[in-house]
């Protein structure tokens, strides 16, 4: 009997003799596009060496990173049965597509939300007498993309008894916003920033008159507006 | 052997309730996601149903035109699947069929010989 | 909703000879190449059965004569040598997207 590393580091057993066909290796397309709100399907499938295994397997999906990630999904399947029962769906979002029996672990992910952008790692375990297992190291990137949403429209006071509107508006690509109010010219006023991720954020520093003030958000998907009204008490002359 | 039985089935009047059971055997209900299909007299299929499995909460889901009418529930103790009926109308006379599916499709792979519902004064 | 469009709505085909199912989805079924397309075989008076799951994989138990094919919105469920137990109607479904949707079926005879 002779050894070998997986791709796990574990040492594994391998038979002197035997001459298997295939290697491990693991078929995932680099990235996935979709849309929020709707479905993705992250394939993956894989060889192994393992000439007819029948035995209990573990199929496991993990993101943000191989190897060590957070699990978001893993089913078990018994010595063979072709049904893979889950025990791990976050937020009861991820299904199994695939048939691991058939070395395909393709997965479902249904409602999209932004944050479920990144890196997602597929991995199998054979735990009967063939003990290996295989994970992809570079994973299926999934690409969420969103028309623009504002999230928030608020206006706030400001220094000199003046007053300051902000607007964070989320998509994907991320959204450019424009301000638009009574004041000529005061959209180009817009102090535009980053914020976290998907989201940005527009503010209009000086809302110099009474009126309504509206916030744009536009990508290459859509675009959305959102209104705030400023209205100031004005004492009657003494 | 799969076996899937629906039952409650019968004449109602406009505007009452009904409640269908299904009781299945063969397999682990506990695997499987539940749904009920309808098939009106001489017309096509229409899903009108989901529940699924505890790894996935529970979650239901229903056809539009039925939601807030109808109910899916299921007891994984006795292997059985509910339709609450309520407020029915003459458009919901059909056989209704129980289905089994997989948590990894939404397809139907073992169909119950159906119960008729018939909505008429 | 995705509206599934089945053609033709009836079809005579003779002993042994080969039968052709069309049903076009309204929107694309198809996600990274898997396609959400499923189809059943209803006799007179029985339930549906389940013939084809995702476009092309044959269920459990069902004669090889039986085959699906087809991607996006465009699919075929053929039988490739009709039996005389194949008089039925035929129905497809698609799981892309909630509600999950029927075309209006085909109905299959001997001609």
């Known amino acids: 009997v002779k050894t070998r590393r997986d791709a796990s580091g574990d040492l594994l057993n391998t038979e002197a003799h035997s001459a298997p066909a295939q290697r491990w290796s693991m078929q995932v397309p680099a990235e996935v596009n979709a849309e929020a709100g709707d479905a993705a399907v992250l394939p993956c499938t894989f060889t192994h060496p393992h000439r007819h295994y029948d035995g209990p397997l573990t199929a496991i999906w993990r993101s943000g990173e191989p190897y060590a990630g957070p699990q978001v999904f893993r089913c078990t399947a018994a010595p063979g049965s072709e049904l893979c029962q889950t025990a791990l769906s976050l937020h009861g979002r991820f299904r199994l597509l695939g048939n691991p029996r058939r070395n395909d672990l393709s997965l479902r992910v249904e409602r999209l939300a932004l944050a479920d952008s990144g890196r997602y790692f597929c991995r199998v375990e054979f735990t009967g007498d063939a003990h290996d297992r295989y994970e992809s190291r570079h994973g299926v990137r999934l690409r969420v993309t969103a028309a623009p949403r504002i999230v928030n429209i608020s206006v706030l006071p400001g220094p000199a008894h003046a007053f300051r509107a902000l607007c964070t508006a989320e998509g994907e690509p991320p959204p450019a916003l424009a301000w638009s109010g009574p004041a000529p010219g005061n959209s180009s006023a817009a102090l535009q920033g980053q914020g976290h991720g998907y989201q940005v954020t527009a503010e209009l520093p000086a809302l110099t008159r009474d009126g309504r003030y509206t916030c744009t958000a536009a990508n290459s998907l859509g675009r959305a507006e959102a209104s705030v009204y400023l209205f100031r008490f004005h004492g009657a002359p003494g | 052997e799969v076996q899937v039985v629906e039952s409650g089935g019968g004449l109602v009047q406009p505007g009452g309730s009904l409640r269908l059971s299904c009781a299945t055997s063969?397999?682990?209900?506990?695997?499987?996601?539940m749904n009920w299909v309808r098939q009106a007299p001489g017309k096509g299929l229409e899903w009108v149903a989901q529940?699924?499995?505890?790894?996935?909460?529970?979650?239901?889901f229903y056809a539009e035109s039925l939601e807030g009418r109808f109910t899916i529930s299921r007891d994984n103790s006795k292997s059985t699947v509910y339709l609450q009926m309520n407020s029915l109308r003459a458009e919901d006379t059909a056989v209704y069929y129980c289905?089994?599916?997989?948590?990894?499709?939404?397809?139907?792979?073992?169909w119950g010989q159906g119960t008729l519902v018939t909505v008429s004064s | 909703d995705i509206v599934l469009t089945q053609s033709p709505d009836s079809l005579a085909v003779s002993l042994g000879e080969r039968a052709t199912i069309n049903c076009r989805a309204s929107?694309?079924?198809?996600?990274?190449?898997?396609?959400?397309i499923h189809w059943y075989q209803q006799k007179p008076g029985q339930p549906p059965k389940l013939l084809i799951y995702?476009?092309?994989n044959l269920a459990s138990g069902i004669p090889a004569r039986f085959s699906g094919s087809g991607s996006g919105t465009d699919f075929t469920l053929t039988i490739s040598s009709l039996q005389a137990e194949d008089v039925a109607t035929y129905y497809c479904?698609?799981?892309?997207?909630?509600?999950?949707?029927f075309g209006q079926g085909t109905k299959v005879e001997i001609k």
């Open positions: 529940i699924r499995n505890k790894i996935y909460t529970y979650a239901t």
């Open positions: 995702r476009a092309s």
């Open positions: 479904q698609q799981s892309r997207k909630s509600p999950w949707t």
């Open positions: 289905t089994r599916s997989l948590t990894g499709g939404d397809y139907f792979d073992y």
């Open positions: 929107q694309s079924v198809t996600i990274s190449g898997y396609s959400f």
């Open positions: 063969g397999f682990n209900f506990n695997d499987y996601f």
